[in-house]
């Protein structure tokens, strides 16, 4: 379970029940392989193939592939946030990890289902998904990194965070943030949220709002509350410092457009 010694918090996704699946569009016919949408998405989309750019917010890598930042990347988390990872052979990644980060295997990893294998390293299987055959319940990644995920329900944003246990990388992440104090207020809020969440054990992706930041750490124009299934979350527009701009909100029925505002 989540409270087992040595295991940090694991994300709980909304279950993909029949009602959620009924909201999905038929996937494109041209895909070589279909995978679930990013984050807690229930619908199917084309998998990325080997060598394609990937990240936390992008489609998933195909079977046998993992999304990995480049080895010489100074800020691997930021690279994944920015979609600057690459889909690489998972067995090669595992060998590299075993060499760099020796760790005992996580429970439940022995019998990954096809869906799990195709998920890519930026996505661990959802805890309460109702259509997993092997249903490994708590299935943390080997990589011992903190990961932010955004699932797309139409254009909405739904975040979830994975934490690994007793991780030296947690300290590395914190020291990285000290090196980057020139980053904007959004980035700082995001890191504060992550550091706060470090102490929680099981995270609900709908129970936390992680802001939508640009590359410089300022707020992106459009911010959204998490979504449920394919139901859009409440969205609003902000300036670069995160201050809401009046008159630009949506309760989920129609998209909110923030394009004309100076908040980049």
């Amino acid at each position: 379970g989540a409270s087992s010694a040595g295991l940090g918090p694991v994300v709980r996704c909304e279950p993909c029940d029949a009602r959620a699946l009924a909201q999905c569009a038929p996937p494109p016919a041209v895909c070589a392989e279909l995978v679930r949408e990013p984050g807690c998405g229930c619908c199917l989309t084309c998998a990325l193939s080997e060598g394609q750019p990937c990240g936390i917010y992008t489609e998933r890598c195909g079977s046998g592939l993992r999304c990995q930042p480049s080895p010489d990347e100074a800020r691997p988390l930021q690279a994944l946030l920015d979609g600057r990872g690459l889909c690489v052979n998972a067995s090669a990644v595992s060998r590299l990890r075993a060499y760099l980060l020796p760790a005992p295997p996580a429970p439940g990893n022995a019998s990954e289902s096809e869906e799990d294998r195709s998920a890519g390293s930026v996505e661990s299987p959802s805890v309460s998904s109702t259509h997993r055959v092997s249903d490994p319940k708590f299935h943390p990644l080997h990589s011992k990194i903190i990961i932010i995920k955004k699932g797309h329900a139409k254009d909405s944003q739904r975040y979830k965070v994975d934490y690994e246990s007793q991780s030296t990388d947690t300290q590395n992440f914190s020291s990285e943030s000290k090196r980057e104090t020139e980053y904007g207020p959004c980035r700082r809020e995001m890191e504060d949220t992550l550091n706060h969440l470090k102490f929680l054990n099981v995270l609900s992706p709908r129970g936390v709002h992680i802001p939508n930041c640009d590359k410089k750490g300022f707020y992106k124009k459009k911010q959204c509350r998490p979504s449920k299934g394919r139901k859009r979350g409440f969205c609003w527009c902000v300036d670069k410092y995160g201050q809401p701009l009046p008159g630009y909100t949506t309760k989920g029925k129609e998209d909110v457009h923030c394009y004309s505002m100076q908040s980049k």
Partner: antibody, heavy 116, light 108 residues
Amino acid sequence: QVQLVQSGAEVKKPGASVKVSCKASGYTFSDYGISWVRQAPGQGLEWMGWISGDNVKTTYAKKFQGRVTLTTDTSTSTAYMELRSLTSDDTAAYYCARGGIVFDYWGQGTLVTVSS
Amino acid sequence: ETTLTQSPGTLSLSPGERATLSCRASQSVSGNYLAWYQQKPGQPPRLLIFGASSRATGIPDRFSGSGSGTDFTLTISRLEPEDFGVYYCQQYGSSPGTFGQGTKVEIK
């Protein structure tokens, strides 16, 4: 409760067109797409196509592309399926169903008979 | 296009007996995205199982789905009189989604 109610049976001549309606109630129509599935007498199920509830996107099975048109009227929460250039092979029960990959609610079916 | 082959074509059983229906795919069904439907004469199909093993809302627990890859099974642990009809499997792991030809479960 969720309901999909289809229009009545039709008898058509070869070469003609048929338009079947499917009125939805009990849920937010724009949140779910509608698929159309047909079943020839004594035969299995065949997916024809899908349209989003907001009438923005359509996907058609290759076999029916160019011959079928799916539309919706969001003001009345009704989906329509028009099939053109009918032949006797198109004699079947036509079902509307909620969803694009899994179909959780179905209409009662509309029998279309094509006969000269 | 993924072809689904169901067997047997017809299953003759008595109420109270166990029914085992098979669905075999021509290629591996990605993510075990397979559903089962029940259809009674003159009625539309009804969703029973999705994701190979998850029961749809309101479906009794005597219905269970299992399997992965290319081989899937629907089991009815104890047939009730209302369970007789035709059962279809459907894959939605590749596009377009396809149905099997059906298995008829009839009263012996």
